[in-house]
């Protein structure tokens, strides 16, 4: 059942963007979806520097000084455990086979907090977004992206890393979140479900969308990802929900049409450069923002999450291709690669628009008016 849309805006432009997010049945995450905090890890359970993962595998950036042994972005593998109660719990295990890079698998032991203590942190991602409780913050101005329209050459690396499909982005893609918050895009990847089962990481009033795109950025204040991990604002992720629409999305088709070539875990191909901004919604002015974490071990906090209010439309066939083409570790289909939503623990989600006004049909509970924390432009 689909409930009225979050905001009755007509979509801007057209292209890849759909209308604003529809809400679904109340399906709030259950208590056991949160990472367990008992059983703190022993010394041997902590990942070494070379094992540090991030929000999927982060592509390499040239550090200002090429130090021997410094963490490269390629050394950051990750995986999310499915977040619905019927799915395996929020656990993963490390796998050191083949190229000796760490991999994370769905299900199994040990629990994430034992692998990386930060996964039991208080300010984790993803979260459930409740527009009625979001703080309208007029200081949150429209996002600005620079250099996201890429020419066909040089080609970009598209890789099945065993837990997502990831496109490594070249230098020169800049994103501005506001005063003192300039970022460079590193990579983008997707999260999805399975046939008839949605797989977005964030949810809206408990509604999970079919899929979600993440564009991961590094603050220009840092030369390397390992320097930025855990630092407030060191990393920023743009997130958008993908949902089913009547037409094929030509921007996404440039990637989805190549998935068969990388069906096997660890395989990769080269794809022509494309308009990365066309993979995102067209309305850069309406979004939610909060501080959270990487959605996979090491679950480093301080990540600025910006979740678009407007969704992106893909055809049913495209969503099926996304969820039914790739294979993960152990001859298992790469599906349901999302983490359970995490408790806010007092965090306030800010909105760049008055999201609480007529944004949800549920008026049973009183609306809490949260105040905007951001400073003006």
């Amino acid at each position: 059942q689909r409930l009225p849309r979050m905001q009755e805006d007509s979509p801007l432009g057209g292209g890849s963007s759909g209308e604003d997010d529809p809400l679904g049945e109340e399906d709030l995450p259950s208590e056991e979806d949160s990472p367990r905090e008992e059983d703190p890890p022993g010394e041997e359970d902590l990942p070494g520097e070379e094992d540090l993962p991030g929000e999927e595998d982060l592509p390499e950036v040239k550090p200002k000084s090429e130090e021997e042994g410094s963490l490269k972005l390629e050394d950051l593998p990750t995986v999310e455990a499915p977040g619905d109660p019927q799915e395996p719990q929020n656990n993963a295990h490390r796998d050191k086979e083949g190229d000796d890079q760490s991999h994370w698998r769905y299900g199994g032991d040990p629990p994430w907090p034992r692998v990386s203590p930060a996964c039991a942190g208080r300010f984790q991602s993803p979260v459930d977004i409740r527009p009625q409780l979001a703080a309208f913050c007029p200081a949150l101005r429209p996002l600005e992206l620079l250099g996201f329209q890429l020419p066909p050459l040089p080609e970009l690396r598209l890789r099945n890393n065993g837990h997502s499909v990831q496109l490594t982005l070249p230098p020169g893609l800049e994103m501005a979140l506001g005063p003192g918050r300039e970022y460079r895009a590193l990579q983008l990847h997707l999260h999805w479900g399975a046939a008839g089962r949605p797989g977005s990481e964030h949810t809206v009033e408990g509604h999970r969308f079919p899929a979600e795109i993440h564009v991961v950025h590094l603050s220009t204040a840092f030369a390397r990802v390992d320097e930025a991990l855990g630092r407030p604002g060191g990393l920023a992720v743009l997130a958008a929900f993908l949902e089913e629409g009547p037409e094929e999305n030509s921007a996404y088709e440039q990637l989805l049409s190549r998935l068969e070539e990388i069906a096997e875990e660890g395989s990769e191909t080269q794809v022509p450069g494309l308009d990365i901004s066309a993979l995102l919604p067209s309305d850069f002015s309406r979004y939610f923002q909060y501080e959270g974490s990487l959605t996979t071990p090491p679950c480093a906090q301080g990540v600025i999450w910006t979740v678009f209010n407007q969704t992106v439309m893909l055809s049913a066939k495209q969503l099926h291709t996304l969820s039914d083409t790739l294979w993960g570790p152990g001859d298992s289909r790469l599906q349901l690669n999302f983490r359970a939503t995490q408790p806010l623990n007092g965090r306030v989600i800010e909105a760049s628009f008055p999201a609480g006004v007529d944004s949800s049909p549920r008026a049973a509970e009183p609306v809490q008016l949260n105040s905007c924390l951001a400073a003006g432009d």
């Epitope: 801007l12 432009g13 292209g15 101005r141 429209p142 600005e144 992206l145 620079l146 250099g147 996201f148 329209q149 800049e174 501005a176 979140l177 506001g178 005063p179 003192g180 918050r181 300039e182 220009t220 204040a221 308009d275 901004s277 066309a278 995102l280 067209s282 309305d283 850069f284 002015s285 432009d377």
Partner: antibody, heavy 119, light 107 residues
Framework: EVQLVESGGGLVKPGGSLRLSCAAS????????MSWVRQAPGKGLELVAA????????YYLDTVKGRFTISRDNAKNTLYLQMNSLRAEDTALYYC????????????WGQGTLVTVSS | DIQMTQSPSSLSASVGDRVTITCKAS??????VAWYQQKPGQAPRRLIY???NRYTGVPDRFSGSGSGTDFTLTISSLQAEDLADYYC?????????FGGGTKVEIK
């Protein structure tokens, strides 16, 4: 009050050099992207060069690459444009422009300094 | 490079008229478009950013709209002091490019 004051323009022979300066006041200079934009007499606007807040990212118009250098001194609140191997087609009014805080769009412009390249 | 094709190149209208200036980008620039006003002998002045956001202090008769490749600046009720050149600019991709300008004259 935001103020941008350009200086350093003048008449120079082809092949010559000039260094333009833009003195900024009324805002925290080190937080802002800055650009040089030029306008040939009776013509439209053209972005010449841009630099991010810490000077780590620079951009140049293709026709000035290798000849012009944009730089900034955040301690002195000053933006520079070093112009070498000047050509007649570089003749224009050169504006210093500030970008919105933390963003790429420009919000304040100086009054400009005129560069004339002629033999 | 992204071309910004601005039209008309000039127009003449009466005080109180509604004036529309259009700008077409040669490729998708999302909403990364700004509009500037340049009065004779002066530096450009900011009007609109992110396609439709008016800067503080800009009269509300000025409005911007559009997304993707087609953008519009509208002056809902032309005033005598609006005599100027108007430029659109995209800042989605380097090189940031400006439209050719529209000269607005008062009849």
């Amino acid at each position: 009050e935001v103020q941008l004051v350009e200086s350093g323009g003048g008449l120079v022979k082809p092949g010559g050099s000039l260094r333009l300066s833009c003195a900024a006041s009324g805002f925290t200079f080190s937080n802002y992207y800055m650009s040089w934009v030029r306008q040939a007499p009776g013509k439209g606007l053209e972005l010449v060069a841009a630099i991010n807040s810490d000077g780590g990212i620079t951009y140049y118009l293709d026709t000035v690459k290798g000849r012009f250098t944009i730089s900034r001194d955040n301690a002195k609140n000053t933006l520079y444009l070093q112009m070498n191997s000047l050509r007649a087609e570089d003749t224009a009014l050169y504006y210093c422009a500030r970008h919105r805080s933390g963003y790429f769009s420009m919000d304040y412009w100086g009054q400009g300094t005129l560069v004339t390249v002629s033999s | 490079d992204i071309q910004m094709t601005q039209s008309p190149s000039s127009l003449s209208a009466s005080v109180g008229d509604r004036v529309t200036i259009t700008c077409k980008a040669s490729q998708n620039v999302v909403s990364a478009v700004a509009w500037y006003q340049q009065k004779p002998g002066q530096a450009p002045r900011r009007l609109i950013y992110s396609a439709s956001n008016r800067y503080t202090g800009v009269p509300d008769r000025f409005s911007g709209s559009g997304s993707g490749t087609d953008f519009t600046l509208t002056i809902s009720s032309l005033q005598a002091e609006d005599l100027a050149d108007y430029y659109c600019q995209q800042y989605s991709n380097y090189p940031w490019t400006f439209g050719g300008g529209t000269k607005v004259e008062i009849k």
